[in-house]
């Protein structure tokens, strides 16, 4: 099934001119992010029923090993060079999720809704910071790693990688809202 | 006709490999699908061996009891699975089934008439 | 590790008896067990799956209930070809030392 965020190397053929208040804009999203990253982590763990909700330390941690870095401290392009890489590996690991819980807990409507709702503030924040990366920086390319393929896991495995990388997004967002 | 069919078991001695195979018919090995190896000693209950996604990651799923002995894998381009079983025991003989499951793979829906291992 | 305990390991029972197997989980597995039927020399066949859908073409008599750690399965009467054994298993964790299956309940005629 196709993932919510499935970019290509990006070109800066930008099809539209960029929206005035580029970095407003963004800022504007990561905020409305860390806003509701709370409430989606705790709608995803109650919705896993046990183990999760008194696990969560162990189950729901964000030790998400390979996870793209980010260094709040870095220029404006750098960190929009990172917040790129972070935002395409949220994405596909956000469709991983959606994908799962659409098996798993196909009743857990709000949950799908919430997490629908996250992915398409995802893809509008990575066309945002690709317009602002390419008319300001000519940044017309940027490697990037996607979020772990869910598919061959076990039940337990699917919930638990799911719990784990929403802690990481709970706790990235905060920090990248503040950053920009 | 959606069928899943054993072959390659037989008499070995302790120590010797076996590989059994489960042709799948019916249905194709390249959607989200799981196939595993279920056994059953003589007069004893199930026991599960290993699962296989045979989507594009492959991840396999392995008992304590086998784990390192044997290997599963699949060829998706002849819709087959197999088993691969070294370093083989008396307590492995038993009749091995091959089973299938949709993803999530939380129950097996798809068995195969078993082929019986003997180790001897 | 989940551990799989299913009682009784086997029973008599007569024609039209309502009989109920009980499968307990060492830990949670949520709703993710599963219920099936094996008659001697054949292989197993899914009766319930996720704790109480019924499986396609299974008699309605064949009902499944429990989540968490505690489930059950009933048959409501009897029949002469419902004489086989029953094998619950948990769909839950595949880990190497999970164990799947229960040990099974051998249902004898009376």
């Known amino acids: 099934s196709p993932l919510p965020i499935t970019p290509v190397n990006a070109t800066c053929a930008i099809r539209h001119p960029c929206h005035n208040n580029l970095m407003n804009q963004i800022r504007s999203q990561l905020a409305q992010l860390n806003g509701s990253a709370n409430a989606l982590f705790i709608l995803y763990y109650t919705a896993q029923g046990e183990p999760f909700p008194n696990n969560l330390d162990k189950l729901c941690g964000p030790n998400v090993t390979d996870f793209p870095p980010f260094h709040a401290n870095g220029t404006e392009k750098a960190k929009l060079v990172e917040l790129y890489r972070i935002v395409v590996y949220l994405g596909t690991s956000l469709g991983n999720i959606t994908r799962d819980q659409k098996i798993l807990n196909p009743s857990a409507l709000s949950l799908h809704s919430k997490l629908n709702a996250t992915a398409d503030i995802l893809r509008g924040l990575l066309s945002n910071v690709l317009c602002r990366l390419c008319s300001k920086y000519h940044v017309g390319h940027v490697d990037v790693t996607y979020g772990p393929d869910t598919s061959g896991k076990d039940v337990f495995q699917k919930k638990k990688l799911g719990c784990q990388l929403l802690g990481k997004y709970k706790q990235i967002i905060a920090v990248l809202a503040q950053a920009f | 006709e959606v069928q899943l069919v054993e072959s390659g078991g037989g008499l070995v001695q302790p120590g010797g490999s076996l590989r059994l195979s489960c042709a799948a018919s019916?249905?194709?090995?390249?959607?989200?699908?799981?196939m595993s190896w279920v056994r059953q000693a003589p007069g004893k209950g199930l026991e599960w061996v290993s699962s296989?996604?045979?989507?594009?990651?492959?991840?396999?799923y392995y008992a304590d009891s086998v784990k390192g002995r044997f290997t599963i894998s699949r060829d998706n381009s002849k819709n087959t699975l197999y088993l691969q079983m070294d370093s083989l025991r008396a307590e492995d003989t038993a009749i091995y089934y091959c089973?299938?499951?949709?993803?999530?793979?939380?129950?097996?829906?798809?068995w195969g008439q078993g082929t019986l291992v003997t180790v001897s | 590790d989940i551990q799989m305990t299913q009682s009784p390991s086997s029973l008599s029972a007569s024609v039209g008896d309502r009989v109920t197997i009980t499968c307990r989980a060492s830990?949670?597995?949520?709703?993710?067990l599963n219920w099936y039927q094996q008659k001697p020399g054949k292989a197993p066949k899914l009766l319930i799956y996720?704790?109480?859908s019924l499986q396609s073409g299974v008699p309605s008599r064949f009902s499944g209930s429990g989540s968490g750690t505690d489930f059950t399965l009933t048959i409501s009467s009897l029949q002469p070809e419902d004489f086989a054994t029953y094998y619950c298993?948990?769909?839950?964790?595949?880990?190497?030392?999970?164990?799947?299956f229960g040990g099974g309940t051998k249902v004898e005629i009376k």
């Open positions: 089973a299938g499951a949709d993803n999530p793979y939380d129950y097996f829906n798809l």
């Open positions: 019916g249905f194709s090995f390249s959607t989200d699908y799981w």
């Open positions: 296989i996604y045979v989507g594009t990651s492959g991840d396999t």
């Open positions: 830990e949670t597995i949520s709703g993710y």
């Open positions: 996720r704790a109480s």
């Open positions: 298993q948990q769909g839950y964790s595949y880990s190497d030392t999970d164990n799947v």
